[in-house]
Amino acid sequence: EEELQVIQPDKSVSVAAGESAILHCTVTSLIPVGPIQWFRGAGPARELIYNQKEGHFPRVTTVSESTKRENMDFSISISNITPADAGTYYCVKFRKGSPDTEFKSGAGTELSVRAKPS
């Protein structure tokens, strides 16, 4: 089996303020078992946007049914985008453990926010 890759096909996405942003992410393998997390930014100061395993993320919904068998699509939609949401978003695969540990990150998708049309 080939090692899992995290694919973020869009290098950049532009969304009008007030709209929803869809950030695409797929993985190429069911192995290893473990959750997906989304972050804005990289490094120690990165901001958690969504954690498949736990947490409450009222503005975030998953695009596909992530509980379904053989699902490899972990794209998310973020509602009511504001200029403060601009940044680079990373889809990160974690490996099951105590605690779960980071396994591989996607290349990132840069979100830019356009002014709300008048």
Partner: antibody, heavy 119, light 110 residues
Framework: QVQLVQSGAEVKKPGASVKVSCKAS????????INWVRQAPGQGLEWIAM????????HYNQIFKDRATLTTDTSTSTAYMELRSLRSDDTAVYYC????????????WGRGTLVTVSS | DIVLTQSPDSLAVSLGERATINCRAS??????????IFWYQQKPGQPPKLLIY???NRDSGVPDRFSGSGSGTDFTLTISSLQAEDVAVYYC????????FGQGTKLEIK
Amino acid sequence: QVQLVQSGAEVKKPGASVKVSCKASGYTFTNYWINWVRQAPGQGLEWIAMIDPSDSETHYNQIFKDRATLTTDTSTSTAYMELRSLRSDDTAVYYCAMDYGSLYAMDYWGRGTLVTVSS
Amino acid sequence: DIVLTQSPDSLAVSLGERATINCRASQSVRSSGYNWIFWYQQKPGQPPKLLIYLASNRDSGVPDRFSGSGSGTDFTLTISSLQAEDVAVYYCQHSRELPTFGQGTKLEIK
């Protein structure tokens, strides 16, 4: 950490019903399947059924399809397994188990609930 | 329905020696490029513990003396050097369709 806490032991008479609960913590309950498995004294493991708490999709072992019902309460992160028309050979430890990879496998287990069926 | 048959039913192995448990499926459990076989260890009075998933992948925290192999219909769980704490009953499970378990193999120390 993931925890599945099951309800206490039950003693039932033949023909009665039992409802076993499994309270989940340490993860988002609606994001992972829950399986139910039983083990009669000194015997092997027998898969009963599974439920997706996000939409209540269920799959049942044909042997239990007419007697078992799985439900969830997402407000309390609790899964339930009801077994009706109990017989003496339903005496077993009943386990709930969470499927962390949507592989129809059982990654994390509760400690089990002993159900004794005796007249 | 796919039936899993484990062999042997019981096994006694000396400490430090290799233990091998087999699991044969009545039809192939390979689908979408994966072998849908899992191995569990159950010690007395405890729930089962997942050891191996998708035939050959060790679960988190499982010692590397445990390994899984096989494809299609024939699968093996190997313990390369038996330790006292490995005494248990071992079960295979498939999920090519809805799950079923093998009947179990009891592993003891010789």
